[in-house]
């Protein structure tokens, strides 16, 4: 539950446990930037290491407009997307999404959102007299979580000091959404 997002009707779905976003289309609309923001941690040991610092996540930045009904944000927001795989920093491939490339009997790692931020967005609506705004919940950083073989997704293990603390400020996201809301998500998404 802690990893679910508060409902943001016309924004991208923030991944839940077991859900991992595809990276945005390559350079579509020239809006994808900083492709390996968090991929440069120094390596130390072979990939079997259990040292947290050995595992690196890729944070992809891209900008988009927020749509809501017939309204659109006056300015684009910059979103961060966590790419699908994690692994020892020195072994990270240059390209994203090549699949598993460490020992299959070892632990499975996922790159998922760590912290979120809320951004207030002014909406431009057709003819509406009231100044309208919404808050979109955006990923602020990513981290690796370990899933050992034969464990289900609910037993993902946290790395880092926040793991033992209850996660304040994580908002539950409803499971199903209206078709129009989902359609709006796809419009102006990237």
């Amino acid at each position: 539950q802690g990893w679910q997002a508060f409902k943001n009707d016309a924004t991208e779905i923030i991944p839940e446990l077991g859900e991992y976003p595809e990276p945005p289309p390559e350079l579509e609309n020239n809006k994808t930037m900083n492709r390996a923001e968090n991929g440069g941690r120094p390596p130390h040991h072979p990939f079997e290491t259990k040292d947290v610092s050995e595992y690196s996540c890729r944070e992809l930045h891209f900008t988009r407009y927020v749509t809501d009904g017939q309204c659109r944000s006056a300015k684009p927001v910059t979103e961060l997307v966590c790419s699908g795989q994690c692994g020892p920093a020195r072994l990270l491939p240059n390209a994203i999404g090549r699949g598993k490339w460490w020992r299959p009997s070892g632990p499975d790692f996922r790159c998922i959102p760590d912290r979120y931020r809320a951004q207030r967005v002014q909406l431009l609506c057709p003819g509406g007299a009231a100044p309208r705004a919404r808050k979109v919940r955006l990923v602020a950083s990513c981290k690796c979580k370990r899933l050992t073989r034969f464990h289900n997704q609910s037993e993902l293990k946290d790395f880092g000091p926040e793991a033992a603390r209850p996660q304040k400020g994580r908002k539950p996201r409803p499971r199903a959404r209206g078709a129009k809301a989902n359609q709006a998500e796809l419009e102006n998404a990237y």
């Epitope: 508060f6 409902k7 943001n8 009707d9 809501d68 009904g69 017939q70 979120y116 809320a118 207030r120 609506c125 057709p126 003819g127 509406g128 007299a129 009231a130 100044p131 309208r132 705004a133 919404r134 808050k135 979109v136 919940r137 304040k168 400020g169 994580r170 908002k171 539950p172 209206g178 129009k180």
Partner: antibody, heavy 118, light 107 residues
């Protein structure tokens, strides 16, 4: 689970003020907008205003301008609505409601009955 | 202020019936309309927003339509838990205003 828990019922005299609290859990207060809506006994719903707890921005219905104050204590994720110069027609159930927009109300508190009587 | 007029103010229906409630705005509000359900002694619950977008967790028998000044809430097959009062609300122009409500009662 998103929850909004409001303070208990109040009985006030005309001319007095009332301050209703709304404690939120399951999310961070500053990530949303807080609205206040009231409902007189047997009547419909009436929007009073909204606030943005993150920056303290507020928008009040003109009917309540000058009499209502909406505030928040972000350290406790609690919102407050104070209504002053109470009159008998202010007798109503007062609801806090929250959401990610300024124009619809996604989650509601259970309501606080405020009775104004001499 | 924009006036929201609901009709009928009350109606009697049976389980399985198709129920339609209308809401008219005194001036155009585009599609900035929401519908809420309220049961006695309880807080309202959001059903539909942007005139036709179903809120998550709300059964698909509820649907909304309309734009501009005329809007409709339809319950395709009334269930026992649907007996309640329904309100429309415009979110286009401050102050946001609600309709007077439609009470759906058991026939």
């Amino acid at each position: 689970q998103v929850q909004l828990v409001q303070s208990g019922a109040e009985v006030k005299k005309p001319g007095a003020s009332v301050k209703v609290s709304c404690k939120v859990s399951g999310y961070t207060l500053t990530h949303t907008f807080m609205h206040w809506v009231r409902q007189a006994p047997g009547k419909g719903l009436e929007w009073m205003g909204w606030s943005d707890p993150e920056i303290g921005d507020t928008e009040y219905a003109s009917k309540f301008q000058g009499r209502v104050t909406m505030t928040e204590d972000t350290s406790t994720d609690t919102a407050y609505m104070e209504l002053s110069s109470l009159r008998s027609e202010d007798t109503a159930v007062y609801y806090c409601a929250t959401g990610d927009t300024t124009y619809k109300f996604d989650y509601w508190g259970q309501g606080t009955l405020v009775t104004v009587s001499s | 202020d924009i006036q929201m007029t609901q009709s009928p103010s009350s109606l009697s229906a049976s389980v399985g019936d198709r129920v339609t409630i209308t809401c008219r705005a005194s001036e155009g509000i585009h599609d900035a309309l929401a519908w809420y359900q309220q049961k006695p002694g309880k807080a309202p619950k959001l059903l539909i927003y942007w005139a036709s977008t179903l809120e998550s967790g709300v059964p698909s028998r509820f649907s909304g339509s309309g734009s501009g000044t005329d809007f409709t809430l339809t319950i395709s097959s009334l269930q026992p838990e649907d007996f309640a009062t329904y309100y429309c609300q415009q979110g286009d122009t401050l102050p946001y205003t609600f309709g007077g409500g439609t009470k759906v009662e058991i026939k």
